[in-house]
């Protein structure tokens, strides 16, 4: 018996996604099956379906297929997140380019090459013809879309609406023309799914006909989506395993983009005198390794043979014999001219971010005994002996009085963020001093970050209002308004305090801002009864580099059914990996007809090391950052969401574990989000709330 072809390769997969029909007239068909492959075969052949199948959802929990005559681009349909669902959409219906003669093209272009509107296939006006949808089943002669039902030479065509012109080809580009890559295509994330000889690519999540190690779950940052060409291993260009059992793999015909510039997310900062990060952007002329042995030219194969040639690594500047880092090693390196030493690191190149501060502290600065007596904002410190009463109020031990001499910056309360002092200014009772940690000091201020030692939740049950648990209540969400427009999110952590991001305050004039609470719609429509509008009375900037701000409200918020506070985590706590969390915001959604309603994206906590791998090792996370990955590709925080919270639940208690800050990209597929770790700054937040005066309600 002839083996039926596996058609799942013809579908684009969106994990943890389903389609919901808003238009009740749309039909769907369901059936119990064992695998998504079975769903795909039936969808492709339209067997037993009362419509042309364009997409299907495989329900992994119920082992069920849902076939659709529509896809995510159809009107009357919306995408929805769901753990147990995987959405598969026939690529022919979402592709806007053609392969070969375009026989399989099922896109929606309906204008000819010269710009004439196409005549509907079911119409005989102005041109009579025999290309009836009923005669060409499976050729999708729908509406007035360009098609090539007989696979003719010129590609997709149509009868035109101009009586003078019977038919004309449509100007639909070849997929190989549309697709392009930069450098050697390591960052290529396009939709080419066949090789240069026309073989269809094997899905990366399949092991037939070829077994391989490139499993999407093992390499989440390599873009192993569906069966698209990729370059995960530093080859000269993208490739894929093929569906031909006799051809294991083949290169794909993807041309180099005309404007051969790399993506912003992939461009290392170019330096010539020093190394930034791992030195992938080092473009200097050092040409010896650490011990003085000269480097071998990159374009030479003597004394060491290699494939790290300028041709193979086009954007890595492999000129002459200069030290470079083309392959993501820990720092720039080169092959050496010594036949006995193949490679060596050029570790003599200095690091760019070595600070040369005269005054510095180690650890958290509790032993700092320098003479600085000014805060970072330029205020003169006040004498310690005048402030002992205040100090006793927020520490529970006797401070070492011998260290608290004069008005010098000190750290008597073991503050994680360094030396500080009282100011004598009633508006700013205390602040940190402009002292950096000493060069090369890596003493962590919190230990065991990736081992759950301290629970984040304070052991208490979820608060209940009027007898109903407020699990769905998001009353702590704040819309920060700048000149009457929403610009950022924030979290109400106390009646008078909102936690948000430093970058959310473009102006220093606090009259330019307002905080809106109790709203669901960004414009406050329909929220009149529950909305509270409060002015901003002060901004307290977080420790240096934190990107946090505590925004003090001019009067306390009134807590009610619509406005509530959200809890803070314990200081230095770790939330377990894979904990399910959410980010909330009114920001950019990618939709043109954005309805202004508060959106939520579901993420899960990822350890810092794993997170760094997802960012291709280009990002080293520190103890002040927390990472969470999207359950739905491309969902996550974006412009307008900054300042908003990453909310997680532990022991039935919801807490703000992270704050969304700019600089980490907008919901980038396969790149987990990096947030400010609130647990790292929890003591600072408590200290501010305790020491700064707030108006009474």
């Amino acid at each position: 018996q002839r083996k039926r072809r596996n058609t799942i390769h013809e579908f684009k997969k969106s994990a943890k996604t389903t389609l919901i029909k808003i238009d009740p007239a749309l039909k769907i068909k369901t059936k119990k099956v064992n695998t998504a492959d079975q769903c795909a075969n039936r969808c492709t052949r339209n067997k037993g379906l009362p419509f042309t199948c364009k997409a299907f959802v495989f329900d992994k929990a119920r082992k069920q297929c849902l076939w659709f005559p529509f896809n995510s681009m159809s009107s009357g349909v919306k995408k929805e997140f769901g753990h147990e669902f995987d959405l598969y959409e026939n690529k022919d219906y979402i592709r806007n380019c053609i392969i070969g003669k375009g026989r399989s093209y099922k896109g929606t272009v309906s204008i000819t090459k010269s710009g004439i509107k196409c005549q509907p296939w079911s119409s005989m006006i102005p041109h009579e013809h025999s290309f009836l949808p009923s005669s060409y089943r499976g050729k999708d002669l729908q509406e007035n879309y360009c098609r090539n039902p007989r696979g003719e030479e010129g590609g997709p065509w149509c009868f035109t609406s101009n009586p003078e012109v019977r038919y004309e080809v449509c100007d639909i580009p070849q997929c190989s023309e549309v697709e392009c890559m930069t450098c050697n295509g390591e960052s290529y994330r396009g939709l080419m799914d066949h090789t240069e000889s026309g073989k269809i690519c094997q899905r990366w999540d399949h092991q037939t006909p070829h077994r391989h190690k490139f499993l999407p779950e093992r390499y989440p940052d390599k873009g192993f989506d569906d069966n698209y060409c990729r370059n995960p291993d530093g080859q000269p260009r993208p490739w894929c395993y093929t569906l031909d059992p006799h051809t294991r793999w083949e290169y794909c015909a993807i041309k180099t983009c005309a404007d051969n510039t790399m993506n912003d997310t992939d461009v290392p900062l170019e330096t010539t005198e020093c190394i930034q990060g791992q030195g992938e952007g080092y473009r200097g002329t050092v040409n010896t390794i650490w011990n003085g042995i000269p480097c071998q030219r990159w374009d030479s194969q003597y004394p060491h043979e290699h494939d790290m040639t300028p041709e193979n690594f086009k954007c890595k500047d492999l000129r002459e014999n200069y030290c470079r880092n083309p392959d993501g090693s820990e720092s720039p390196w080169c092959f050496t001219t010594d036949p006995n030493i193949r490679v060596g690191y050029c570790s003599q190149i200095p690091n760019c971010d070595m600070s040369h501060g005269q005054d510095c502290y180690r650890g958290n600065g509790k032993n700092y005994m320098g003479n600085l007596s000014q805060t970072r904002s330029g205020l003169t410190c006040s004498m310690w002996d005048k402030n002992m009463e205040d100090l006793h109020r927020h520490i529970f031990w006797e401070p070492d009085a011998s260290k608290l001499n004069e008005n010098y910056c000190r750290n008597p309360d073991d503050d994680a963020h360094g030396p500080w002092c009282y100011t004598g200014n009633p508006l700013i009772p205390w602040d940190y001093c402009p002292i950096s940690r000493c060069e090369g000091d890596t003493t962590p201020t919190i230990v065991n970050l990736d081992h759950p030692v301290i629970s984040c939740a304070k052991t208490k049950q979820l608060r209940v209002v009027n007898g109903i648990p407020t699990r769905t209540n998001i009353g702590w969400m704040v819309s920060l308004r700048y000149r009457n427009k929403h610009i950022c999110g924030g979290s109400l952590i106390k009646e008078s305090w909102v936690l948000t991001a430093r970058q959310c305050f473009p102006s220093r004039d606090l009259k330019d801002y307002e905080a809106w609470l109790g709203i669901h719609d960004v414009h406050g429509r329909g929220d009149e009864k529950c909305k509270q509008v409060l002015n901003v009375s002060q901004l307290v900037y977080g420790p240096e580099g934190s990107d946090l701000v505590l925004m003090k409200l001019a009067r306390p918020a009134v807590l009610d059914d619509f406005v509530s506070t959200i809890d803070l985590p314990n200081y230095g706590c770790t939330i377990p990996e894979k904990t399910s969390c959410s980010v909330y915001g009114w920001g950019y959604t990618g939709l043109i007809n954005y309805d202004g309603l508060l959106r939520v994206a579901h993420l899960y906590i990822m350890g810092n090391e794993k997170c760094s791998q997802h960012h291709r090792g280009k990002v080293t996370l520190n103890e002040s950052e927390i990472c969470a990955g999207a359950e739905k590709i491309g969902s996550g925080p974006c412009e307008g969401d900054y300042g908003g919270p990453l909310v997680c639940e532990q022991h039935k208690m919801r807490m703000v574990l992270g704050v969304i800050v700019p600089g980490r990209g907008c919901a980038i597929p396969n790149r987990p989000g990096i947030f400010v770790r609130v647990a790292y700054y929890a003591k600072w937040i408590h200290k501010i709330i305790l020491t700064y005066k707030v108006p009474q309600s």
Epitope: D264, Y482, Q503, S507, D512, P662
Partner: antibody, heavy 119, light 110 residues
Framework: EVQLVESGGGLVQPGGSLRLSCAAS????????ISWVRQAPGKGLEWVGV???????DYASSAQGRFTISRDNSKNTLYLQMNSLRAEDTAVYYC?????????????WGQGTLVTVSS | DIQMTQSPSTLSASVGDRVTITCQAS??????LAWYQQKPGKAPKLLIY???KLASGVPSRFSGSGSGTEFTLTISSLQPDDFATYYC????????????FGGGTKVEIK
């Protein structure tokens, strides 16, 4: 080298449109606020508009409703789209990096590009 | 909205002179003020920020002072290279602002 390079200037008729570009190198445009400043021949500096790190924009009253600032992070480039141009928009247009993420002083300037609005 | 008024608009001085330029804000801008120097055909160059902090690479003969609404740029001993136009700029807020810069002061040779 850290620098800003403006382009796209030229002669345009009153009522016409023009798009200026400001290409950054050595730093990323999304990590600082960036502003456009213009200078009419023989006149002083006039602030035009700014795009902050968070993507929000502010404009001078003379530019409000006619000019739009945007950025393309993937190209590391800032743009100034100018519509309904008038003779009084004739000037050298500079893009300038603002220190930090919000409104502040300018610590890096481009060389400028000349826009002439004339029939 | 904040307006910046600079005076004088032109100033004639000789090499070695002590030169003072003032800038007035229509409302308090705390210390959020910057000073720039511009030579013909060139882009402006930052001299002073936050009213009194010297920008990197700027000679120490330049100094700034003031806070609130009144600010001053002083060149302690005018050098040949200092003949240029100087601008102040408020770095406080640009909400509803016509121009963030002062009108400029041209320092010319006497």
């Amino acid at each position: 080298e850290v620098q800003l390079v403006e382009s796209g200037g030229g002669l345009v008729q009153p009522g016409g449109s023009l798009r200026l570009s400001c290409a950054a190198s050595g730093f990323t445009v999304s990590s600082n606020a960036i502003s456009w400043v213009r200078q009419a021949p023989g006149k002083g500096l006039e602030w035009v508009g700014v795009i902050y790190v968070i993507g929000v924009t502010d404009y001078a009253s003379s530019a409000q409703g006619r000019f739009t600032i945007s950025r393309d992070n993937s190209k590391n480039t800032l743009y100034l789209q100018m519509n309904s141009l008038r003779a009084e928009d004739t000037a050298v247009y500079y893009c300038a990096r603002v220190y930090d993420s919000g409104w502040n002083h300018f610590n890096l300037w481009g060389q400028g590009t000349l826009v002439t609005v004339s029939s | 909205d904040i307006q910046m008024t600079q005076s004088p608009s032109t100033l004639s001085a000789s090499v070695g002179d002590r030169v003072t330029i003032t800038c007035q804000a229509s409302q308090s801008i705390s210390s959020w003020l910057a000073w720039y120097q511009q030579k013909p055909g060139k882009a402006p160059k930052l001299l002073i920020y936050e009213a009194s902090k010297l920008a990197s690479g700027v000679p120490s003969r330049f100094s700034g002072s003031g806070s609130g609404t009144e600010f001053t740029l002083t060149i302690s001993s005018l050098q040949p290279d200092d003949f240029a136009t100087y601008y102040c700029q408020q770095a406080y807020s640009v909400a509803n602002v016509d121009n963030a810069f002062g009108g400029g002061t041209k320092v010319e040779i006497k």
